[in-house]
Interface confidence: low
């Protein structure tokens, strides 16, 4: 632990002015693991003037950073790049004349205290005023800056020409697109100082490439993947004062695929589990031994989980018998195409053949998370209809 500091497993505390520290505290190798440090408190360190780019990076778990009543003059732009957990920063009563929002733009700070610094009035610190105004809480900091006449001006009153928040305008087409197709998004940004423009595509899977000039740009997304349906694409304008973004949501239409269809499993109902992907939502139709299965309250499709364009569910059968054994085919359709898959189901042996008995269902209330999704009409004659499972068991309970 550096001289003038005390260290524990999670804290570094440097408040002794003599001899004091001249550089940001660093832990010796083989001492405390810097990743476990969550708080650094520094006070009365008049010779601590700079936070360099690599001074803080080892403290990846750092949540609170306090440097007060010290000589801090300069903070490197990327000083906190690795400190994504930082929530509270207190730089009260230091020697900062300027501070860029680039230091903090990637952080989700709940507190940034800058009181008592000799800021120079310029566009460079206008972002602090904007931040203060956005907070609009009663405990707003009393911040000042020195103008050209070395006069203290409240930051709240600071007016600087050609120094404002930028704007971003995404001229998005209707962002509903068919899988495999391509789209181009155009965005224009404006502001003074002239903002930089960039695209935030998150975890977009589809191939994309941007062409960006200072104030206009286009983003080309090709061979669009169904995995990108529901994703957000943003155009961001950023300057010294702050940033603005305009966003659109991408909807991808694609033909259904049945990604999972398994043999029945028994819980408090029998379930033929399936997963279907498709957008718009596919209509589902079951066939039993080649004929349309007419659903009822005893045999019906249940969707348990919907994950945007993916549907997980069951063909639910109440108390099926040997009469329900056979081939079950699921067909999923929408306007872009259809898919089908088939499984063989064996619920129980024929009477007199020892192949297991009708399962004994526990008395559990089944929670229905969805509704039947089949909306293809029944146009078949019913001579091949699946036998109903509407039977009463030995205990008189109806299933």
């Amino acid at each position: 632990c550096p001289t003038s500091c005390k260290c524990s497993a999670s804290r570094i505390w440097c408040s002794d002015p003599s001899p004091g520290i001249v550089a940001f505290p660093r832990l010796e190798p083989n001492s405390v693991d810097p990743e476990n440090i969550t708080e650094i408190f520094i006070a009365n360190q008049k010779r601590l003037e700079i936070i360099n780019e690599d001074d803080v990076e080892a403290y990846v778990g750092l949540r609170n950073l306090t440097i007060v009543d010290s000589g801090l003059k300069f903070v490197a732009h990327k000083a906190f790049l690795k400190n994504s957990n930082l929530q509270h920063i207190n730089f009260t009563r230091n020697k900062l004349t300027s501070l860029s929002r680039k230091h903090f733009r990637h952080l989700d700070l709940s507190e940034l205290i800058l009181v008592g610094n000799p800021f120079t009035c310029s566009c460079d610190i206008m972002w602090i005023k904007t931040l203060q105004e956005a907070k609009s809480s009663p405990d707003t900091q009393d911040l000042y800056c020195l103008n050209e006449s070395s006069k203290n001006i409240p930051l709240a009153n600071l007016q600087i020409p050609n120094c404002g928040l930028p704007s971003a305008n995404l001229a998005a087409p209707n962002l509903t697109v068919e899988e495999g197709k391509s789209i181009t998004l155009s965005c224009s940004v404006a502001g003074d100082p002239v903002p930089n423009m960039y695209w935030d595509v998150g975890n977009l899977v589809s191939k994309h490439m941007n062409e960006t000039s200072h104030t206009q740009g286009s983003l080309r997304i090709t061979n669009i993947s169904s995995d990108d349906s529901g994703k957000q694409i943003s155009c961001v304008a950023e300057n010294l004062v702050g940033e603005d973004q305009d966003s659109v949501n991408l909807t991808v239409h694609f033909a259904p695929t049945i990604t999972f269809l398994e043999s029945p499993t028994s819980d408090h109902h029998w379930c033929i589990p399936f997963t279907v992907k498709g957008n718009p939502k596919p209509a589902l139709q079951w066939f039993y031994n080649g004929a349309i299965l007419n659903e009822s309250k005893y045999i019906c499709t249940k969707i348990h989980v919907t994950n945007h364009t993916e549907y997980h569910g069951c063909l639910q059968l109440d108390n099926p018998t040997h009469m329900n054994n056979g081939d079950y085919t699921l067909i999923a359709k929408n306007e872009y195409g259809k898919d089908e898959k088939q499984i063989s189901a064996h619920f129980m042996g024929w009477p007199g053949i020892d192949d297991g008995a009708n399962p004994n269902y526990p008395d559990v209330i089944y929670e229905d998370y969805g509704t039947a999704a089949n909306d293809i009409g029944d146009t078949t004659n019913r001579s091949n209809e699946i036998p109903s499972t509407d039977v009463t068991d030995k205990t008189g309970r109806e299933h």
């Epitope: 490439m209 941007n210 062409e211 000039s213 200072h214 206009q216 080309r220």
Partner: antibody, heavy 118, light 112 residues
Framework: QVQLQQSGPELVKPGASVKISCKAS????????MNWVKQRPGQGLEWIGR????????NYNGKFKGKATLTADKSSSTAYMQLTSLTSVDSGVYFC???????????WGQGTTLTVSS | NIVLTQSPASLAVSLGQRATISCRAS??????????MHWYQQKPGQPPKLLIY???NLESGVPARFSGSGSRTDFTLTIDPVEADDAATYYC??????????FGGGTKLEIK
């Protein structure tokens, strides 16, 4: 379809200037970069620079800074390249080319032959 | 600036055979998950024509006998099978993030 039509051949004297034009059609002129490329007789291709007609933003190959000036007129969908203080080394064929997806130059003008001779 | 070195400078290939042209970049041209390398064909008296964009994507209207491969610094243009009409000079070009953008020195393909 996308087309780039360049102005005709130029024969100029050393020290003079010339302005070559490239008229675009078949696409939104203001939203694609326009590039300029030089080819000396029997030689390879050299990228001179590009302009974004939407806002006039330019990038230049350092070798051509001060030699070439790129401009664009949105109203006529025409890009221009002015070459100044011409010498014999400036002789060659100059192409305009549109940046397509991924910046590949997907459409080229037919080329303008510049001859600098006294 | 990124320097592109093409090899060979010229090659002669029999009709129906395979032609392979290499392009090596002095540093990586990969960006945004794409390789910003393109291939062009130029015949005498004509402007270049885009064949392959982003290393491996066939420009529309270009015959499927042209293909591109590679990433980072090493790229290849393959023509298989070669036809008489393919006699031309072929250039690679990189468009990595910051201009200036550069072309390879060219490879002259002759059909035997």
């Amino acid at each position: 379809q996308v087309q780039l039509q360049q102005s005709g051949p130029e024969l100029v004297k050393p020290g003079a200037s010339v302005k070559i034009s490239c008229k675009a059609s078949g696409y939104t002129f203001s939203s694609s970069w326009m590039n300029w490329v030089k080819q000396r007789p029997g030689q390879g291709l050299e990228w001179i620079g590009r302009i974004y007609p939407g806002d006039g933003h330019t990038n230049y190959n350092g070798k051509f800074k001060g030699k070439a000036t790129l401009t664009a007129d949105k109203s006529s969908s025409t890009a221009y390249m002015q070459l100044t203080s011409l010498t014999s080394v400036d002789s060659g064929v100059y192409f305009c080319a549109r940046s397509g997806y991924g910046y590949g130059f997907d459409c080229w003008g037919q080329g303008t032959t510049l001859t600098v001779s006294s | 600036n990124i320097v592109l070195t093409q090899s060979p400078a010229s090659l002669a290939v029999s009709l129906g055979q395979r032609a392979t042209i290499s392009c090596r970049a002095s540093e990586s041209v990969d960006n945004y998950g794409n390789s910003l390398m393109h291939w062009y064909q130029q015949k005498p008296g004509q402007p270049p024509k885009l064949l392959i964009y982003l290393a491996s994507n066939l420009e529309s209207g270009v015959p499927a006998r042209f293909s591109g491969s590679g990433s980072r610094t090493d790229f290849t243009l393959t023509i298989d099978p070669v036809e008489a009409d393919d006699a031309a000079t072929y250039y690679c070009q990189q468009n990595n993030e910051d201009p200036p953008w550069t072309f390879g020195g060219g490879t002259k393909l002759e059909i035997k």
